[in-house]
Interface confidence: medium
């Protein structure tokens, strides 16, 4: 049989952050190559990463077409053949379908992880500080422009701010439905800030990792009386 020497892929894993989406699997190929197929529940299968010796396939271009769709993916193990025309690959022999493994369903809007946010700036005016979170670009496109995280998630996305006096470790928190915080601070005190993106309606992957810490008295901030 043409498929006797092929090993089915296993440990299929979706790795997705801010919609950059890669399907990974094992094992490293020996005498075989892989082809990945992706489809929506109601759509046709589309082949990607033809006859690759990699154990990953970037499916971002497909899933960003509609991040609210549910996607199915599968990885075919295809025997590697030598022929008179040099190295060729065949989708099985005698019309056989090579072995494949299904990935779990992937719903980008629900499953993509939130990337680490970045504090764009902070500005102090008297005893108030305005902290602005960068509205990151995603790879989701509309009208030839890349949409931001806020564009895609709308009001489903909030940010949590952690802030504390440089001289102490007691953290306070604030939340915002936009990309800005306005918080009260003690005059004459320096504060440090870190933010986290959150989608409260999710059950998994609700929170991003914390942003890098930014502290007052460093370049990123601005002070006004």
């Amino acid at each position: 049989s043409g498929t006797t020497n092929t090993v089915a892929a296993y440990n299929l894993t979706w790795k997705s952050t801010n919609f950059k989406t890669i399907l990974e699997w094992e094992p490293k190929p020996v005498n075989q190559v892989y082809t990945v197929q992706i489809s929506t529940k109601s759509g046709d299968w589309k082949s990607k990463c033809f006859y690759t010796t990699d154990t990953e396939c970037d499916l971002t271009d497909e899933i960003v077409k509609d991040v609210k769709q549910t996607y199915l993916a599968r990885v075919f193990s295809v025997p590697w053949r030598n022929s008179t025309h040099g190295k060729e690959t065949l989708f099985g022999t005698h019309g056989e379908e090579p072995p494949f493994t299904n990935a779990r369903k992937f719903l980008p809007y629900r499953d993509t992880k939130l990337g680490q946010p970045t504090i764009q700036s902070f500005e102090q005016v008297g005893t108030k500080v305005n902290v602005t979170v960068e509205d990151e670009r995603t790879l989701v496109r509309r009208n030839n422009t890349f949409l931001s995280l806020r564009d895609v998630f709308g009001k489903d996305l909030i940010y949590t701010l952690y802030y504390w006096k440089s001289s102490s470790s007691g953290k306070k928190t604030a939340k915002t439905n936009t990309n800005e915080f306005l918080i009260d601070v003690d005059k004459g005190e320096n504060y440090c800030f870190s933010v986290q993106a959150v989608i409260p309606s999710r059950t998994v992957n609700r929170k991003s990792t914390d942003s890098p810490v930014e502290c007052m008295g460093q370049e990123k901030g601005e002070f006004r009386e």
């Epitope: 895609v152 936009t178 800005e180």
Partner: antibody, heavy 124, light 108 residues
Framework: QVQLQQWGAGLLKPSETLSLTCAVY????????WSWIRQPPGKGLEWIGE???????RYNPSLKSRVTISVDTSKNQFSLKLSSVTAADTAVYYC??????????????????WGKGTTVTVSS | EIVLTQSPGTLSLSPGERATLSCRAS???????LAWYQQKPGQAPRLLIY???SRATGIPDRFSGSGSGTDFTLTISRLEPEDFAVYYC?????????FGGGTKVEIK
């Protein structure tokens, strides 16, 4: 066809609390945000705040300390309370539906259904 | 907050003419969250355009929106008698959601 019907006291004295209610007919509260907007006589529109069916709120920071917006899903209505009113709060108050429309990878937001407005006058 | 500045304050035109209304934001606004409304005396505002370019249901195609970033435009290609009203732009991307001061389109 969704319609918003609003009511509440039209004449208040300074320091009193303004209280308005907006009922949603022909549709559900769920899946939308519900806003209050006001318009002082001869002036432009000012957004006061909004509430989701789940009760999550967003307020205009300039009014936040005085505003409470609440929702009653059993009655399919939402309400506005504005405390410690002054003459500067005299306005026509509108309720509106803020629709999240998802299309081609992202959301649009717009107020597509409005109440007819309630005139509120604050005078001693 | 994002300040929306509309110009001109008043536009005096005749029926059949073209009206061009400007809305300038104090900082960049996602076009997804930019809308235009029409208001006639004694009435609630009425949605015309959402997402900066898309016409709301039932809005005639003489109304069109354009622009991005900080500059947005509402164009009425040929004014009809019922188009004389006040027009507001609005952003719903950053709290507080804000409206422009309005442009009154009046009969010349």
């Amino acid at each position: 066809q969704v319609q918003l019907q609003q009511w509440g006291a039209g004449l208040l004295k300074p320091s009193e609390t303004l209280s308005l209610t907006c009922a949603v007919y022909g549709g559900s509260l769920s899946g939308y945000y519900w806003s209050w907007i006001r318009q002082p006589p001869g002036k432009g529109l000012e957004w006061i705040g909004e509430i989701g069916a789940s009760g999550s709120t967003r307020y205009n920071p300039s009014l936040k300390s005085r505003v409470t917006i609440s929702v009653d899903t059993s009655k399919n209505q939402f309400s506005l309370k504005l405390s410690s009113v002054t003459a500067a709060d005299t306005a026509v108050y509108y309720c509106a539906r803020d629709t999240p429309y998802y299309y081609e990878g992202g959301y649009y937001y717009y107020m597509d259904v409005w109440g007819k407005g309630t005139t509120v006058t604050v005078s001693s | 907050e994002i300040v929306l500045t509309q110009s001109p304050g008043t536009l005096s035109l005749s029926p059949g003419e073209r009206a061009t209304l400007s809305c300038r934001a104090s900082q960049s606004v996602s076009s997804s969250f930019l809308a235009w409304y029409q208001q006639k005396p004694g009435q609630a505002p009425r949605l015309l355009i959402y997402g900066a370019y898309s016409r709301a249901t039932g809005i005639p195609d003489r109304f069109s929106g354009s622009g991005s970033g900080t500059d947005f435009t509402l164009t009425i290609s040929r004014l009809e008698p019922e188009d004389f009203a006040v027009y507001y732009c609005q952003q719903a991307g950053v709290v507080p959601y804000t409206f422009g001061g309005g442009t009154k389109v009046e009969i010349k």
